[in-house]
């Protein structure tokens, strides 16, 4: 056969579907690899061919489109399972070709089992809700194209294992689930089960997502530097180790590029000829506010180092702040035998 543009195994599309549910999988060629759509390809005389490699096998084989009740079918650029079976797991390839052109891509499909509480190895999308922000909604994802608009499915929402009904601040509204005022207690996995009829059969679509309640932009503030502060003086003798922590609180801000950094005499530590090390740690609150600590350390501080200006800086999408550490050289304690004795007139 003639050469084929092989896009390899597209691991971006690690498709996971539930066992015994319908699945519609679009050929990724038209979405991500080619600059034309299926209609254009079809009208240009190109044919879309599907085949697959079973899990733990090397042999490519054609997909059987003659199964009872058309369990697997193809419609335009979509491969349909009505429904899936566990042993449908494997790598699927769609190939677009005619006598002069050929292009193909493979993608992994995993058919996943779930338990009665919707627990499964499925990777769950995360939806962030702002805490105490007013009404916010989540929508049952990835159900478009499964049934025509004339069909009115029934939708049941669950939090974890429990059907959502008569919840205080969570209201099912068809494909949407409304949170009147999102609270930390609303964190968890939410499942919508969409039930619809087709050709005398009833199908179920199960979609689970994780809700994470995060800090609200209404409450977001510029970074707050807790340390260094005016109450702590770093008093050291030459030769001692100087350790100055910079601890900064950041409100949760979607996509904010948060940074903490030190300058010494207005320069990056790297631009100064002293042996400085900086270690960073990060912790998060339940609403994904962030606390970053950067500890500046000079192993053996000199009297010159103790005269320098050490400033901790922090920035987020809300603004920038800076705070200087109070560093001074420890005045040596008087030596009694010489200095105090002199005060008493000893010679």
């Amino acid at each position: 056969s003639e050469r084929c543009d092989d896009w390899g195994l597209d691991t971006m599309r690690q498709i996971q579907v539930f066992e015994d549910e319908p699945a519609r999988i679009k050929c990724p060629l038209f979405e991500h690899f080619l600059k034309f759509n299926y209609s254009t390809a079809h009208s240009a005389g190109l044919t879309l061919i599907w085949y697959w490699t079973r899990q733990d096998r090397d042999l490519e084989e054609p997909i059987n489109f003659r199964l009872p009740e058309n369990r697997i079918s193809k419609e335009k650029d979509v491969l349909w399972f009505r429904p899936t079976l566990l042993n449908d797991t494997g790598n699927y390839t769609c190939m677009l070709r005619n006598t002069t052109y050929c292009s193909k891509v493979a993608f992994p499909l995993e058919v996943v089992q779930k338990d009665s509480c919707f627990n499964s190895p499925m990777k769950l999308p995360v939806h962030k809700l702002y805490i105490e922000y007013g009404i916010q909604r989540i929508t049952c994802p990835n159900v478009d194209g499964y049934f025509p608009s004339s069909v009115k499915p029934t939708i049941t929402w669950y939090m974890g294992c429990y059907k959502i009904q008569n919840f205080n601040n969570v209201i099912p509204e068809g494909m949407n689930l409304s949170f009147l005022i999102a609270l930390i207690s609303n964190n968890g996995n939410y499942t919508c089960v969409v039930t619809y009829p087709e050709n005398g059969r009833t199908f179920h679509l199960t979609r689970t997502l994780t809700v994470k309640v995060v800090g609200s932009p209404k409450n977001a503030v510029p970074p707050v530097i807790h340390s260094p502060n005016d109450h702590v003086v770093y008093e050291k003798e030459p030769g001692e180790e100087l350790l100055i922590p910079c601890t900064v609180y950041f409100s949760f801000l979607m996509d904010s590029r948060n940074e903490v950094w030190w300058t010494i005499d207005g320069k990056k530590p790297d631009d100064i000829t002293i042996d400085v090390t900086i270690n960073e740690s990060i912790s998060h609150s339940r609403t994904e506010d962030e606390t970053r600590t950067q500890i500046l350390s000079i192993k053996k501080v000199t009297s010159e180092d103790l005269k320098r200006s050490y400033v901790c800086h922090a920035r987020s999408a809300k603004g920038e702040v800076a705070k200087a550490a109070k560093v001074k050289q420890k005045v040596p304690a008087p030596r009694y035998t010489v200095e105090l004795a002199c005060g008493f007139g000893a010679t």
Partner: antibody, heavy 118, light 108 residues
Framework: EVQLVESGGGLVQPGGSLRLSCAAS????????MSWVRQAPGKGLVWVAE????????YYPDTVTGRFTISRDNAKNTLYLQMNSLRAEDTAVYYC???????????WGQGTTVTVSS | EIVLTQSPGTLSLSPGERATLSCRAS???????LAWYQQKPGQAPRLLIY???KLASGIPDRFSGSGSGTDFTLTISRLEPEDFAVYYC?????????FGQGTKVEIK
């Protein structure tokens, strides 16, 4: 003298993989966040990935999320970019660059060319 | 995503003239987080201005930056022959970090 030297570019088929490296010298590598920025032929600059000083935090634009992985080895003063499921539109010169706090990309490498073509 | 739009696309000027390049953001950028770069053919970009108005190390003072919020400007007071190049603005207030599409300053 600060130096960033990229390597690992080349010709790869669509769907293939490539690993770029960036060797850093002349500065305290572990003090800087590091990024990869690419430039397609005749086009502008596009940020591709960033990694925090310690390597625990990574950031990507949607166009490469799931396909590209940035990593670093502070002991070897080296930055990496693992690129999988490569596409024709990933063809570009790839630069590594360093940043510190409010100082953006103050030093760049000379770039390494990645060509994705069958 | 913060989109940065540079204008004009091309600026045709003579050496000695003043160049004014604009960068407009689709949403507010904290001034400290806007930078300007110069790029010549076959070379890596070079940092000119950071924090909207601070001159990077080793950059001549004929380059200056100004602006805040959504509107930023790079000014070259008197163009030297070596200044003819492409200039990019860049923001890092929010991820993804984004660049403008570039302004080419060419010899008239």
């Amino acid at each position: 003298e600060v130096q960033l030297v990229e390597s690992g570019g080349g010709l790869v088929q669509p769907g293939g993989s490539l690993r770029l490296s960036c060797a850093a010298s002349g500065f305290t590598f572990s003090s800087y966040a590091m990024s990869w920025v690419r430039q397609a032929p005749g086009k502008g600059l596009v940020w591709v990935a960033e990694i925090s000083r310690g390597g625990s935090h990574t950031y990507y634009p949607d166009t490469v999320t799931g396909r590209f992985t940035i990593s670093r080895d502070n002991a070897k003063n080296t930055l990496y970019l693992q690129m999988n499921s490569l596409r024709a539109e990933d063809t570009a010169v790839y630069y590594c660059a360093r940043s510190y706090g409010n100082y953006p990309f103050d030093y760049w490498g000379q770039g390494t060319t990645v060509t994705v073509s069958s | 995503e913060i989109v940065l739009t540079q204008s004009p696309g091309t600026l045709s000027l003579s050496p000695g003239e003043r160049a004014t390049l604009s960068c407009r953001a689709s949403q507010s950028v904290i001034g400290s987080y806007l930078a300007w770069y110069q790029q010549k053919p076959g070379q890596a970009p070079r940092l000119l201005i950071y924090s909207a108005s601070k001159l990077a190390s080793g950059i001549p003072d004929r380059f200056s930056g100004s602006g805040s919020g959504t509107d930023f400007t790079l000014t070259i007071s008197r163009l030297e022959p070596e200044d003819f190049a492409v200039y990019y603005c860049q923001q890092d207030t929010r991820y993804p970090i984004t660049f403008g599409q570039g302004t080419k300053v060419e010899i008239k």
